[in-house]
Interface confidence: low
C-alpha cells in the first residue's frame, strides 16, 4: 500500500486546514492508528494528534480544541485531520505516520502554507504644489504572507518605486508614487491596488490629488476704453485668476485711496457714475496659501467736453 497526501496545503489565515493522509492499501489491510506531528527542521517533532481505530481521536494539549476529524461519513483508511482556525504560527511541515496491519508503518510529509491577506494603508505625501520637481504623491503599504503585490492605477503620469521588508513570517511591501505636480492633476484619483493569493479580489484604496497653484491674474472690463466716459453707470473691473485653494481678492489704487462710492465685491470692483476722479491705476491682488499675484490697469475716464474741444482743435489743425 501507499499513503496519499498533498505536497502543500494552502489556507487563508483563520480558515480550517484539512491535512490529508489516506492509506491506499490492499484489500483486507487495516489502519491501526495515525499519528500527526509537526516536523519542522530544527524543532523536535511536536505531536498534534493520534487517531486510533479503537479509541478514537486523542489531541495533544498544545492543540486542544483545534484538531478534529473531518465530518462523517469517514473511511477507516482515512487519517486526515482538520486543523481549525489556522494562524501564521501553524505554517510549516507536518508528518503523518500510519501504522497498518499487516503491512507495517508508512509516513508522509506535507507543507502547510498560511496565507495572511494584507490590510493595506495609503499615506498621502507632503502637500503638492505646482512648480515642485518630482514629489512623493502617496505611499501604499501592505503586509502579508506571502508578500503582496502593490501597484498603482491612475491616469496621472508618474513614477513608482517599491521596497520590501521581510519579517519572520510575513513581508511588508511599500510602493511610492512620485509625480511632477501640475494643476491639471487636481481632483484626479490615484488608486493603490493590492493583490494577494489570500484575497478574493484586489483591495483598492483611492486618494484624490490636490495640487496647490495660483494662476496669473488679469483684469477684464477695459476692453473698450471708449465706454469709460464721464457719467457712465455700471462700470466695473473684474479680476480673473484661479487657484487651489480658491484665492481671495483685494483691490487697491496705486496713486491714492479708492475713490468714495467705489464698491469692492470679491473679484469685482464696481464704480458709481463715472467722473474724472475715477481715473487712476488700480491693482488687483490675488492670494491663496500657496502664492500671491498682482495685476494692475490704468483707468482713464474720458470727459466728452474736453474731447470735443480737442476734436475741434484737431479739425482746425487739419
Amino acid at each position: 500500500g501507499e499513503l496519499e497526501t498533498s505536497d502543500v496545503v494552502t489556507v487563508v489565515l483563520g480558515q480550517d486546514a484539512k491535512l490529508p493522509c489516506f492509506y491506499r492499501g490492499d484489500s483486507g489491510e487495516q489502519v491501526g492508528q495515525v499519528a500527526w506531528a509537526r516536523a519542522d527542521a530544527g524543532e523536535g517533532a511536536q505531536e498534534l494528534a493520534l487517531l486510533h481505530s479503537k479509541y478514537g481521536l486523542h489531541v495533544s494539549p498544545a492543540y486542544e480544541g483545534r484538531v478534529e476529524q473531518p465530518p462523517p461519513p469517514r473511511n477507516p483508511l482515512d487519517g486526515s485531520v482538520l486543523l481549525r482556525n489556522a494562524v501564521q504560527a501553524d505554517e510549516g511541515e507536518y508528518e503523518c505516520r500510519v501504522s497498518t496491519f499487516p503491512a507495517g508503518s508508512f509516513q508522509a510529509r506535507l507543507r502547510l502554507r498560511v496565507l495572511v491577506p494584507p490590510l493595506p494603508s495609503l499615506n498621502p505625501g507632503p502637500a503638492l504644489e505646482e512648480g515642485q520637481g518630482l514629489t512623493l504623491a502617496a505611499s501604499c503599504t501592505a503586509e502579508g504572507s506571502p508578500a503582496p503585490s502593490v501597484t498603482w492605477d491612475t491616469e496621472v503620469k508618474g513614477t513608482t518605486s517599491s521596497r520590501s521588508f521581510k519579517h519572520s513570517r510575513s513581508a511588508a511591501v511599500t510602493s511610492e508614487f512620485h509625480l511632477v505636480p501640475s494643476r491639471s492633476m487636481n481632483g484626479q484619483p490615484l488608486t493603490c491596488v493590492v493583490s494577494h493569493p489570500g484575497l478574493l479580489q484586489d483591495q483598492r484604496i483611492t486618494h484624490i490629488l490636490h495640487v496647490s497653484f495660483l494662476a496669473e491674474a488679469s483684469v477684464r472690463g477695459l476692453e473698450d476704453q471708449n465706454l469709460w466716459h464721464v457719467g457712465r453707470e455700471g462700470a466695473m473691473l473684474k479680476c480673473l485668476s484661479e487657484g487651489q485653494p480658491p484665492p481671495s481678492y483685494n483691490w487697491t489704487r496705486l496713486d491714492g485711496p479708492l475713490p468714495s462710492g467705489v464698491r469692492v465685491d470679491g473679484d469685482t470692483l464696481g464704480f458709481p457714475p463715472l467722473t474724472t476722479e475715477h481715473s487712476g491705476i488700480y491693482v488687483c491682488h490675488v492670494s491663496n496659501e500657496f502664492s500671491s499675484r498682482d495685476s494692475q490697469v490704468t483707468v482713464d475716464v474720458l470727459d466728452p467736453q474736453e474731447d470735443s474741444g480737442k476734436q475741434v482743435d484737431l479739425v482746425s489743425a487739419s
Epitope: 483563520g14 491577506p117 490590510l119 503586509e143 519579517h167 513570517r169 511588508a172 478574493l200
Partner: antibody, heavy 117, light 107 residues
C-alpha cells in the same frame, strides 16, 4: 480559547484623556489585527482604528485622527486605545475586537466611558 | 466614506418564521460584508463573513448572500434566542462602517 479582556469603566471630565486596555489570550497576538469600535448609548457601532501588533502598524478613522492613539505591548499581549480631549459625545462603550483579517471575529466585553462635568 | 443602510430598522416576527434583513452599500464593496448579532448589554458576535460564510458555532438557520451593493441575512426559522440587534459591516475600505442596526423582536 480566544479571549479579549478589557479594563473597567471610566468616568472622565471634558478635556481629559482616557486609556482603555485589551488583554488578548488563546491565540498568537502578533498574527492578528486588533480593532477598536465604539457604541454610544442606544446607537450603532463606529470604527475607531486598528493596530497590527506584529509590526505596530496603525490605521485610524479620520474622524478621530489627532485625538486617538492605539498601541500594543507584545510582552503582555495587550492593546491600548487612548482618546484625548474628551467631550460629552465621546460617552460610549468602547470595544476591542480581533480581526481575521478584515472581519472582527472575537470581541472584548466592552469598557464603558462616561464623560461628564 | 461608504454608507451601509439597513432595513428594516425594527422587525417583529413569530417563532418559526423566515426572517430577512437587508443591507445596502453606497458603493460596491464586493463581498466584504460581515453580519453581527448583539444582545442587550453584550458585545457584538460575528455571524457571517465574506457575505455568505457562517462563522464557527453559528447555527445553520442563519445564512447570508449578496455581492456588490445589496446583501441579505436570513434566519430560516426564527427562534426565541434570536431576539437581538443585527448589524452589517463593510470591510472593503476604511473607515470600516456599520449599518444602523435592525432590532428583531418576537411577536
Amino acid at each position: 480559547q480566544v479571549q479579549l479582556v478589557q479594563s473597567g469603566s471610566e468616568l472622565k471630565k471634558p478635556g481629559a484623556s482616557v486609556k482603555v486596555s485589551c488583554k488578548a489570550s488563546g491565540y498568537t497576538f502578533t498574527s492578528y489585527y486588533i480593532h477598536w469600535v465604539r457604541q454610544a448609548p442606544g446607537q450603532g457601532l463606529e470604527w475607531i482604528g486598528w493596530i497590527y501588533p506584529g509590526n505596530v502598524n496603525t490605521k485610524y478613522n479620520e474622524r478621530f485622527k489627532g485625538r486617538v492613539t492605539i498601541t500594543a505591548d507584545k510582552s503582555t499581549n495587550t492593546a491600548y486605545m487612548e482618546l484625548s480631549s474628551l467631550r460629552s459625545e465621546d460617552t460610549a462603550v468602547y470595544y476591542c475586537a480581533r480581526s481575521n483579517p478584515y472581519v472582527m471575529d472575537y470581541w472584548g466585553q466592552g469598557t464603558s466611558v462616561t464623560v461628564s462635568s | 466614506d461608504i454608507q451601509m443602510t439597513q432595513s428594516p430598522s425594527t422587525l417583529s416576527a413569530s417563532v418559526g418564521d423566515r426572517v430577512t434583513i437587508t443591507c445596502r452599500a453606497s458603493q460596491s464593496v464586493n463581498n466584504d460584508v460581515a453580519w453581527y448579532q448583539q444582545k442587550p448589554g453584550k458585545a457584538p458576535k460575528l455571524l457571517m463573513y465574506y457575505a455568505s460564510n457562517r462563522f464557527t458555532g453559528v447555527p445553520d438557520r442563519f445564512s447570508g448572500s449578496g455581492y456588490g451593493t445589496d446583501f441579505t441575512l436570513t434566519i430560516s426559522s426564527l427562534q426565541a434566542e434570536d431576539v437581538a440587534v443585527y448589524f452589517c459591516q463593510q470591510a472593503y475600505r476604511s473607515p470600516y462602517t456599520f449599518g444602523q442596526g435592525t432590532k428583531l423582536e418576537i411577536k
